[in-house]
């Protein structure tokens, strides 16, 4: 067999061309080589690195009858939707045994209207509150100058003269639109239009005006709402669960809140149907036609104690000589607070009323004065909390004790010689 030639000459007979265009352009780079025998695989380089996921096609055409004759190999690299990351120097690469050959380079460039990397976003802001908007664009060609517009009115005399990447807005009193224009040598691109919705400011100074066991009256100071009057305010109250789980500013309460709406003005609301002697957290937000303000922080409040709403139940009173035994049960009606004890009053037909504080016991043995001949003796009992006494029970007549009727031994309570204090009889 004849001696072969040394593989020192490049097999490339066609090199990649140049592509310059705007973003989104589709183009093809092409290289061609001529080899003898089995055609090699053609690889593509960008800036000297193999493109592992290149969208390339390779066509091989034999120039003779025998597969050992010369072949023309054409490789085409397709660039779809040209991006900045596609730009650079492109070459074809083939390995012929241990020899490496690269084509002459072609170049892919990007040139067109500015391209936005960042555009202003829709957002809500509180009235008269400063905020920033962002806009960023690039070429090539550079430089790219920005011009901000508010409600379609330019905020500078010319592109590049006003704020560039960040626009600081000291505050708005009405809902407005913002956009930015990007200018380069090829022309102008306009960003999306961002709508900045002006909401009422957060209300301030939420506080208690008055307290009742089952209702709280609260008031607040409204925030600015720009040109949009407040339509209503919404108050939420939630059981505090002993303060667990709600910290100042925590976004959501642990359970479903009680929600009330208040017409405004006045910026005041009476919250009813509450539990007495119970800790709550309350917050308020105010709404205009543009939407609601942010909520205030949760404010801890507490309903005061009330008096028991009913008398003690199941009162029984029996008499045995000079002693009377009385016992009762806790009122079924709400106590509206912490039960501190019971008061008992008894009176005969012609004797003054005697009033006693029994404490938390639910029974008492009375030592009656005299020989026990007092007639028509009646007993009343009332429960009390720190807020005062609940209603007295109806008078219960003292029944004579019959043998066989159980009478436990109880601490005797001496009748005071005079009442501890006067109590209006029923």
């Amino acid at each position: 067999a004849p001696r072969g030639t040394q593989a020192e000459e490049s097999p490339f007979v066609g090199n990649p061309g140049n592509i310059t265009g705007a973003r989104g352009l589709t183009g093809t780079l092409r290289c061609q080589l001529q080899v003898q025998g089995e055609p090699p695989e053609v690889h593509w380089l960008r800036d000297g690195q193999i493109l592992e996921l290149a969208d390339s096609t390779q066509t091989q055409v034999p120039l003779g009858e025998d597969e050992q004759d010369d072949w023309i190999v054409v490789s085409q690299l397709r660039i779809t939707s040209l991006q900045l990351s596609d730009t650079g120097q492109y070459q074809c690469l083939v390995f012929l045994g241990h020899q490496t050959f690269v084509s002459q380079p072609g170049y892919v460039g990007l040139e067109g209207l500015p391209y936005f990397l960042e555009e202003p976003e829709d957002r809500t802001v509180a009235a008269n509150t400063p905020f920033n908007l962002s806009c960023q664009a690039q070429g090539p060609p550079e430089p790219v100058d920005l011009l901000w517009l508010q409600d379609a009115v330019p905020l500078a005399t010319a592109p590049g003269h006003g704020p560039q990447r960040s626009l600081h807005v000291p505050g708005l009193n009405k809902t407005s639109s913002f956009s930015c224009e990007a200018h380069n040598a090829k022309g102008v691109t306009t960003s999306r239009t961002a709508t900045i919705t002006v909401l009422p400011q957060q209300p301030r100074n939420l506080h208690l005006v008055s307290r009742q066991p089952t209702e709280l009256e609260v008031a607040w100071t409204p925030g600015l709402s720009g040109i949009y009057p407040l339509t209503h305010c919404t108050l939420q109250a939630v059981l505090s669960d002993d303060g667990m789980g709600i910290q100042a500013g925590e976004p959501d309460p642990p359970e479903e809140p009680l929600t009330s709406q208040a017409s405004v003005p006045p910026h005041q609301l009476r919250l009813g149907s509450l539990h007495p002697h119970t800790p709550y957290h309350i917050r308020v937000a105010c709404t205009s036609s543009q939407g609601p303000s942010s909520w205030t922080h949760w404010l801890p409040v507490e309903t005061p104690e009330g008096v028991p709403l009913g008398p003690p139940e199941n009162i029984s009173a029996t008499r045995n000589g000079s002693q009377a035994f009385v016992h009762w049960q806790e009122p079924r009606a709400p106590l509206q607070g912490t039960l501190l004890g019971y008061r008992l009053a008894y009176q005969g037909q012609d004797t003054p009323e005697v009033l006693m504080d029994i404490g938390l016991r639910q029974e008492v043995t009375l030592e009656l004065q005299g020989d026990g001949s007092v007639s028509n003796l009646t007993v009343c009992v009332a429960a009390y909390t720190a807020a005062g006494d609940g209603p007295w029970s109806l008078p219960v007549p003292l029944e004579a004790w019959r043998p066989g009727q159980a009478q436990p031994v109880h601490q005797l309570v001496k009748e005071p010689s005079t009442p501890a204090f006067s109590w209006p009889w029923w």
Epitope: E38, E41, H43, G48, L93, H98
Partner: antibody
Amino acid sequence: EVKLLESGGGLVQPEGSLKLSCVASGFDFRRYWMSWVRQAPGKGLEWIGEINPAGSTINQTPSLKDKFIISRDNAKNTLYLQMSKVRSEDTALYYCVRLSVVFYYYGMDYWGQGTSVTVSS
Amino acid sequence: ELQMTQSPASLAVSLGQRATISCRASESVDNYGISFMNWFQQKPGQPPKLLIYAASNQGSGVPARFSGSGSGTDFSLNIHPMEEDDAAMYFCQQSKEVPPTFGGGTKLEIK
């Protein structure tokens, strides 16, 4: 199964000539680059050269270019190494090697058992 | 031509332990985003066998205990855990330039 069987080795006098052969089987010989590598007794490996599938292009170690000629006969599935002007430093085991694309580039993926050449007077 | 220097020249490793062989090139063997570095194993009386190509890729049928790493001029071959069958000569080889060149070899024995 890929097989490469070298032959033609033996004793040769200094300045003499020798032609080594390598018969390939188990693959389409006409589509592969082939190579020769040698290993002197107790020494490392030395690449001699390679030839393209058509036999038209040869890459060789510069120092051996004028002494050794690599060729192939695709009809016979045979690779050759024509050795001339041999010297004692050419004493070695001569391997026939197939090249394959391993990771974009070519790697020496199959080797014959080798044929021994001894240069001595 | 590109010189390849292997170390150590010989190495004895206990079964189950790790063997590490190093190879240094006289200049970088990286190009086009590829490391043109290969490793071969040669047992007595047998031809070399391709173990690792492109610095870290395992050849066909090569057990997972063989791994390669490195880039530029410094490369290594790791065998872990060492098995009896792994006692052999190991060669590194660069494919970046013609002529492709081999390291001097490392003889790996069982301790």
